[in-house]
Interface confidence: low
């Protein structure tokens, strides 16, 4: 049989070898694809099959716009003028070239001797899934699980069936090295299809600075607020590169994007709880602030300041 590769959405015509110029009953196509249950038989006299495929006057099979579900096996059997039976057999695969891959959240600088996220390479809309690979100074970068770590994710769109690939590169650069150039390429793995390359990125490498103490600043002071008021929690830490700040409420991480500031506008009792922030620094591990208890009060008659750990009413909590 013959292997055919066709681009999704485009027409595909499969010729029936040995078909007479004016086909008679003696021609049939059999299809076994994602659209069919086992084999589907088509003949020139039959109706076009749901606008998906139809037999042309010359006996060829036309699929006007091929899709993923049309992948499969196509067989034609025809009897020529001499009464000899001729068979044609096709194995059809479809493909879709994605948009040009890009590196999202590229690092502008890396810290020596610690793991750094270089960026995430994203390719959207491929079929089959294909592969993403990273390059350092134009040469393939082989993940070793230590100094070079690649975390890959493949998702399939529930409706289109096309794939989105994500590849996150983490490296541990050495001190005193040259400025590295990273790039990423997507390959479908099909013959005669060249890889698609991203624009290169050139993060600079700098020496690490250890983090200093972490502070949780509370506004209003003490963390006690009237309903409808605003509470601002600010996590302050000095480190290079700046760590990611996540927030914890009642012992549970809040599902928010990392940010050094947590704003609670128009607070109600649902905002009450024990808050702390966690600074994650690759070379020094996570650092958690002292917690603060946020209380919403109707009366303003509080006794001790509920927001401070020691009851002194101080709004600044330092480690």
């Amino acid at each position: 049989g013959q292997n055919i590769t066709a681009r999704i959405g485009e027409p595909l015509m499969l010729s029936c070898k040995g078909a007479p110029k004016k086909p008679t009953q003696k021609l049939e196509w059999k299809l076994n694809t994602g659209r069919t249950e086992a084999w589907k038989v088509l003949s020139p006299q039959g109706d076009p099959w749901d606008s998906v495929a139809r037999i042309l006057p010359n006996g060829s099979l036309l699929l006007p716009a091929i899709g993923i579900v049309d992948e499969g096996t196509f067989r034609c059997r025809a009897t020529n003028r001499l009464g000899k039976e001729v068979k044609s057999n096709y194995r059809v695969r479809v493909y879709q070239i994605p948009g040009k891959p890009e590196i999202v959240n590229p690092a502008s600088e890396l810290t020596a001797n610690v793991p750094n996220k270089v960026g995430t390479c994203v390719s959207e809309g491929s079929y089959p899934a294909g592969t993403l690979s990273w390059h350092l100074d134009g040469k393939p970068l082989i993940p070793d699980g230590k100094g070079t770590v690649v975390k890959e994710e493949t998702r399939r769109h529930p409706e289109t069936g096309l794939f989105t690939l994500r590849s996150e590169l983490t490296v541990t650069p050495a001190q005193g090295g040259t400025t590295p150039t990273y790039s990423c390429s997507f390959s479908l793995g099909l013959p005669r299809r060249r890889p698609l390359n991203t624009a290169p990125i050139q993060p600079r490498v700098r020496e690490p600075l250890p983090p200093e103490g972490i502070q949780l600043l509370v506004e209003p002071e003490g963390g006690t607020v009237a309903p409808g008021g605003t509470v601002t929690l600010t996590c302050a830490i000095s480190a290079q590169p700046p760590p990611q700040i996540h927030w914890i409420k009642d012992g549970t991480p809040l599902p928010l994007a990392p940010s050094p500031v947590l704003l609670l506008p128009e607070v109600g009792h649902e905002d009450e709880g024990i808050y702390s922030c966690v600074a994650t620094h690759p070379s020094h591990g996570p650092q958690e602030s002292p917690p603060v208890n946020i209380r919403v009060t109707e009366t303003g008659d509080e006794g001790q300041a509920a927001g401070s750990v020691d009851g002194s009413g101080l709004g600044t909590l330092a480690l």
Epitope: E288, P290, N293, V309
Partner: antibody
């Protein structure tokens, strides 16, 4: 004021599933906090079972992980406990509670596992 | 799992005296500055009631004769002066790496 109320059968046969409901009033379970199930055995030992976070994620006591499921119905402001393959050792008072420091609890419901 | 060990298991204190209950964690339950340790009081037929949160903070509505202290792995609940209504079982609980409770201390008033 926040109130929690447990409900469900008070008698379950061994090997069956125990299902309890916690109805929360005065606060939306999708607004904040984690919502927990805790049980207290006849000897008064307290055991944390698991929680459902307001985001919908769950976390379970490792000793129960293979048997426990906590789900919710946000339209009714309820969350649920299902404990499978119960034995007589699952006889306890089951409480639902709110948050990391458990400032709010239900009154508890005694569930007896017996043939 | 972090294991919490409470001592003593039971305690009899005269009216007006001090009651001290200890709770030891198998590993640290907080930062160097504060700890995710909480104390509860439970009376028969009732759910536990929060007394102290974050090791030393008094829950609103709880009398000032209750106090909590400690950090890292060792924590203490003090009641002074003890009153008759304080007869109950007291539990420590942490909210670090999931949650566990201590075994409880039964306080009896002499």
């Amino acid at each position: 004021d926040v109130q929690l109320q447990e409900s469900g059968p008070d008698l379950v046969k061994p090997s069956q599933s125990l299902s309890l409901t916690c109805t929360v009033t005065g606060y939306s379970i999708t607004s904040g906090y984690s919502w927990h199930w805790i049980r207290q055995f006849p000897g008064n030992k307290l055991e944390w079972m698991g929680y459902i976070h307001y985001s919908g994620s769950t976390n379970y006591n490792p000793s129960l992980k293979s048997r426990i499921s906590i789900t919710r119905d946000t339209s009714k402001n309820q969350f649920f406990l299902q404990l499978n393959s119960v034995t007589t050792e699952d006889t306890a008072t089951y409480y639902c509670a709110r948050g990391g420091d458990f400032a709010y609890w239900g009154q508890g419901t005694l569930v007896t596992v017996s043939a | 799992d972090i294991v919490l060990t409470q001592s003593p298991a039971s305690l009899a204190v005269s009216l007006g005296q001090r009651a001290t209950i200890s709770c030891r964690a198998s590993k640290s339950v907080g930062t160097s500055d504060s700890s995710y340790m909480h104390w509860y009081q439970q009376k028969p037929g009732q759910p536990p009631k929060l007394l102290i949160y974050l090791a030393s903070n008094l829950e609103s509505g709880v009398p000032a004769r209750f106090s909590g202290s400690g950090s890292g792995t060792d924590f203490t609940l003090n009641i002074h002066p003890v009153e008759e209504e304080d007869a109950a079982t007291y539990y420590c609980q942490h909210s670090r790496e999931l949650y566990t409770f201590g075994g409880g201390t039964k306080l009896e008033i002499k």
